[in-house]
Interface confidence: low
């Protein structure tokens, strides 16, 4: 049956899917608060632009009886059930915000004719790449892969004079939703990461990981894992680690590293942490005071989804264009809009661009310091600390293969970013 969109005559509605299975275990009340805060901002912006229209959100809850595991692994059908609810009510907003789980987003995209835009806080997996009406407001796996390949190839920085072509990936199946899909992308045999690396092995057992740390016959010195410092400590403990081991800890949605009083524990000295550049004003926001750092990013993505809709609505209304058209559905990409915490850029495929930050532990201060940053929009690495106080020999990152001779480094007088 044809679902009518409540999206004309000065009244514009946002359908927000409130799913029991979510990328992050966030109370739905917090997401409602984020959406409502976003609505207030959008109304103000439209009013300032002289557009006298009504913007509201309809929250659509799943019944929670069938799909109540709380995590994403059982979410495939939940999104479709919610779409059926919309279909039964024959009422749909101008835009769909949610779902956040890769499985449900992928299934919803397959099973519906999406003539309206879908905005997701999550949907991290490669299966949600290149979807014409899907916008993702949290860094998807593709962006991580591009950073890693770029960083592996870099060989002309004062602290990284070797190209790397090998890696171990630790993935034991208990990861959070974001980590699950990030590691999945690295594991996939047909992914860009796998294509660019000469050697890659996935470690699935704790013991495998622990053995590699001191194994003289290891095939790579580099281990990628995903999670926070506590997760690493549970696995590694205070075990001895060979001096040329480098652990890359992917912990994108955690800005605790940037807090003033944080001291890096000793077990983090062989670790480079990949995280996102921290926001500025979120800590004081009414909806985020009680949120953990990860959940703050999740709630922010919901809020920014509302602001993105407001941005597009304003443009189309000012140009006198119809909102219920394929043009509107396909417009949520290749743009920059004013997010809650500053400008937000979406790439050609509607995926959020961001500044990734690689941190190291200073052996002098025991503080996390920024080694380099990476702008996903232009696929470039920018060095920040040209003389890092590393634990590694000569304050340089080691070669990825023990015993391999030096490879061509950078030029003598100039240091360049990649």
């Amino acid at each position: 049956s044809q679902v009518s969109q409540n999206c004309h005559n000065g009244s514009y509605e946002i359908s927000v899917l409130m799913m029991g299975n979510s990328a992050f275990a966030e109370p739905l009340k917090n997401l409602e608060d984020a959406v409502n805060e976003g609505l207030e901002i959008v109304r103000g912006r439209l009013q300032n632009a002289g557009l006298n229209v009504t913007v509201n959100a309809t929250f659509m809850y799943s019944d929670g009886l069938i799909h109540n595991s709380g995590d994403c692994r059982s979410s495939t059908c939940e999104g479709l059930d919610l779409l059926r609810k919309i279909s039964n009510a024959q009422r749909m907003g101008c835009v769909l915000i949610g779902p956040s789980c890769t499985y449900s987003t992928f299934q919803m995209y397959l099973d519906t004719e999406l003539s309206y835009p879908m905005i997701s806080a999550g949907s991290f997996g490669l299966s949600c790449d290149y979807k014409e009406t899907l916008t993702r407001l949290m860094s998807p796996a593709r962006k991580l892969m591009y950073f890693l390949v770029n960083f592996w190839k870099t060989n002309d920085l004062p602290f990284k004079t070797y190209s790397w072509s090998t890696s171990y990936v630790y993935k034991n199946g208990t990861e959070t939703e974001d980590c699950f899909w990030y590691l999945n992308a690295l594991e996939a045999s047909v992914s860009y990461f796998s294509h660019e690396l000469g050697f890659k092995v996935v470690l699935r057992q704790d013991k495998e990981f622990q053995d590699i740390l001191m194994d003289h016959n290891r095939k790579s010195n580099v281990i990628i894992m995903c999670g926070g410092p506590e997760f690493l400590y549970k696995l590694k403990g205070d075990r001895a680690v060979a001096e040329d081991i480098v652990i890359i800890l992917v912990d994108l949605f955690n800005d605790q590293y940037f807090e003033d009083n944080v001291t890096a524990p000793d077990y983090m000295k062989n670790v480079l942490v990949l995280t996102l550049s921290p926001g500025n004003s979120l800590l004081n926001s009414s909806f985020s005071r009680n949120l953990s750092p990860t959940k703050r990013d999740f709630a922010l993505a919901y809020l920014n989804g509302i602001l993105l809709f407001g941005h597009m609505l304003k443009i189309f209304l000012e140009n006198g264009e119809n909102i219920t058209t394929p043009k509107f559905a396909h417009a949520f990409r290749n743009l920059t809009f004013e997010g809650y915490d500053g400008p937000v850029t979406l790439d050609d495929w509607g995926d959020v661009d961001s500044t990734m930050v690689l941190l190291y532990t200073s052996v002098d201060t025991k503080k996390y310091k920024v080694l380099l940053t990476y702008d996903t929009h232009v696929n470039k690495t920018y060095p920040v600390d040209m003389s890092p106080t590393f634990t590694w020999k000569n304050s340089k990152l080691p070669n990825d293969i023990t015993g391999r001779g030096p490879q061509g480094g950078g030029g003598s007088e100039n240091l360049y970013f990649q």
Epitope: T373, Y382, M386, G411, E413, N414, Y416, F417
Partner: antibody, heavy 122, light 110 residues
Framework: EVQLVESGGGLVQPGGSLRLSCAAS????????MHWVRQAPGKGLEWIGE????????NVHEKFKDRFTISVDKAKNSAYLQMNSLRAEDTAVYYC???????????????WGQGTLVTVSS | DIQLTQSPSSLSASVGDRVTITCRAS??????????MQWYQQKPGKAPKLLIY???KLASGVPSRFSGSGSGTDFTLTISSLQPEDFATYYC????????FGQGTKLEIK
């Protein structure tokens, strides 16, 4: 002495092609980013794109992606700009430049070539 | 792209004058405590020459009468006491996201 020298400019008909060269000397070419910037008569500077000789990673501005290609020959310490489907509005002086990154982590265009004039006219 | 707007577009001044040119970016060009903004001088028929990098750092060989300031979106180039050789066109440039230049400010003799 650090130097960049462009060549290959001249008169070309609309729809035609031209390949500009930039010969680099006096510095380690392979680890730099080499750029092309143009300036139409009486107008401002417009960035076209860049290439990193060490791994031939290129970034070309959206405006030029379909028609312009940047390449390098590391053996010759040279960068190239291949321009196809030329239009009258491509008439400009084309400069080759490089970015350096200082030890403090800043980057900018510090050395420029003298420029080569491309005129697109029938 | 980040847009850069320079003002004024042209300016007449005399030798010895203090001159200020401003450049406004469409979004912040700050990056980890640095402002990725440069100023270049260009004379007719010549290539641009770097004057200031990172908003306020003087490039090698540039006279100290040139100075730069600003952060975020608003930047200024100041020439404290104009010399005859300073009459030229000045461009600001950002390297925060790709590379864009301002439209230029032509500094002429009054």
């Amino acid at each position: 002495e650090v130097q960049l020298v462009e060549s290959g400019g001249g008169l070309v008909q609309p729809g035609g092609s031209l390949r500009l060269s930039c010969a680099a000397s006096g510095f380690t070419f392979s680890s730099t980013w080499m750029h092309w910037v143009r300036q139409a008569p009486g107008k401002g500077l417009e960035w076209i794109g860049e290439i990193k000789p060490s791994n031939e990673l290129t970034n070309v501005h959206e405006k030029f992606k379909d028609r312009f290609t940047i390449s390098v020959d590391k053996a010759k310490n040279s960068a190239y700009l291949q321009m196809n489907s030329l239009r009258a509005e491509d008439t400009a002086v084309y400069y080759c430049t490089r970015t350096i990154t200082t030890t403090e982590g800043y980057w900018f265009f510090d050395v420029w070539g003298q420029g080569t004039l491309v005129t697109v006219s029938s | 792209d980040i847009q850069l707007t320079q003002s004024p577009s042209s300016l007449s001044a005399s030798v010895g004058d203090r001159v200020t040119i401003t450049c406004r970016a469409s979004e912040s060009v700050d990056y980890y405590g640095s402002s990725l903004m440069q100023w270049y001088q260009q004379k007719p028929g010549k290539a641009p020459k770097l004057l200031i990098y990172a908003a306020s750092k003087l490039a090698s060989g540039v006279p100290s009468r040139f100075s730069g300031s600003g952060s975020g979106t608003d930047f200024t180039l100041t020439i404290s006491s104009l010399q005859p050789e300073d009459f030229a066109t000045y461009y600001c440039q950002q390297t925060r996201k790709a590379y864009t230049f301002g439209q230029g400010t032509k500094l002429e003799i009054k």
